[in-house]
């Protein structure tokens, strides 16, 4: 039931950043800061913001929005012991 | 009884690489996010990262790059490569179920 | 996030009443705040989580309050098994977790 909810917010997610230009989005995140400063996953590298390419643009945004979700679960898990948020690994490779 | 085990602690050369195990006994740690500590001698503690159980692993901004966080559920185990070392990597190295669990920790010394 | 405890050293008497703070830089992700014992050549101890909220096992001498960017531990009355150093730690969704700089109790 999770896993669904997580895919429609991603698709919602999704949807939201489509209807932003480019370069809106872009001034958005800047203005914004959005990402932190965080690292990610084995080849998950965050790119520099001033890609101007939407893709790109989308991609980054995107994997540090995933980030900071996986992020906040951890923190709730083990610093709020909230263990209904904790990822399991079941189905996930 | 329910412990963490770190080792592959020693003395390494600035610039070499180590890979430290953390090796569970008495519980699975599969289901369990997976935490690296550090704590510099005489010094307070330091967040490296965490690695989740599905294997995706992050890490504080000073140890991207350098420290990667893997995990093998079959050995119940979870690693951390460190590469590129310096001096002031020098420490002993936690690895801790969640944070209510922690090893006993293994002493890396930095120096050539 | 920087987490800031003060004093970094408290010289105390066994059953005194003793409070340390941890004030956070920006406010605590969630207020998940916790707090943590370390004793020399020991690894750290959790004690609280979520600022307030008692670990299984942790004498009820030990409480947590605070919320946003001030937190306090207190022991109600402090015990010989009570000397130690303790760490704050707090959520953040930049940096993951961030820990205070320690306060060591000692024996006056």
């Known amino acids: 039931r999770r896993d669904v909810a997580h895919g429609i917010l991603n698709e919602a997610y999704r949807k939201v950043l489509d209807q932003l230009s480019a370069g809106k989005h872009l001034q958005s995140l800047v203005a914004r800061g959005v990402g932190g400063s965080l690292g990610g996953g084995a080849g998950d590298d965050a790119e520099p913001l001033s890609k101007r390419h939407s893709d790109g643009i989308f991609t980054d945004s995107y994997s540090r929005y995933r980030k900071q979700m996986a992020v906040k679960k951890y923190l709730a898990a083990v610093l709020g012991k909230r263990y209904k948020q904790r990822v399991k690994n079941k189905g996930r490779r | 009884e329910v412990q963490l085990v770190e080792s592959g602690g020693g003395l390494v050369q600035p610039g070499g690489s180590l890979r430290l195990s953390c090796a569970a006994s008495?519980?699975?740690?599969?289901?369990?996010?997976m935490t690296w500590v550090r704590q510099a001698p005489g010094k307070g503690l330091e967040w490296i990262g965490f690695?989740?159980?599905?294997?995706?692993?992050y890490y504080a901004s000073w140890a991207k790059g350098r420290f990667t966080i893997s995990r093998d559920n079959s050995k119940n185990t979870v690693y951390l490569q460190m590469n590129s070392l310096r001096a002031e990597d020098t420490a002993v190295y936690f690895c801790?179920?969640?944070?209510?669990?922690w090893g006993q920790g293994t002493l890396v010394t930095v120096s050539s | 996030q920087v987490l800031t405890q003060s004093p970094s050293t408290l010289s105390a008497s066994v059953g005194d009443r003793v409070t340390i703070t941890c004030q956070s830089s920006?406010?605590?992700?969630?207020?998940?705040l916790a707090w943590f014992q370390q004793k020399p050549g020991k690894a750290p101890k959790f004690l609280i989580y979520?600022?307030?909220k008692l670990e299984s096992g942790v004498p009820s001498r030990f409480s947590g309050s605070g919320s946003g960017t001030e937190f306090t531990l207190t022991i109600s009355s402090l015990q010989p098994d009570d000397f130690a150093t303790y760490y704050c730690?707090?959520?953040?969704?930049?940096?993951?977790?961030?820990f205070g700089g320690g306060t060591k109790v000692e024996i006056k």
């Open positions: 801790a179920r969640d944070l209510d669990l």
């Open positions: 008495g519980i699975d740690l599969n289901s369990y996010y």
């Open positions: 690695i989740d159980a599905g294997g995706d692993a």
């Open positions: 920006e406010s605590v992700y969630g207020n998940y």
């Open positions: 979520e600022a307030s």
């Open positions: 730690a707090g959520g953040d969704i930049s940096e993951g977790v961030a």
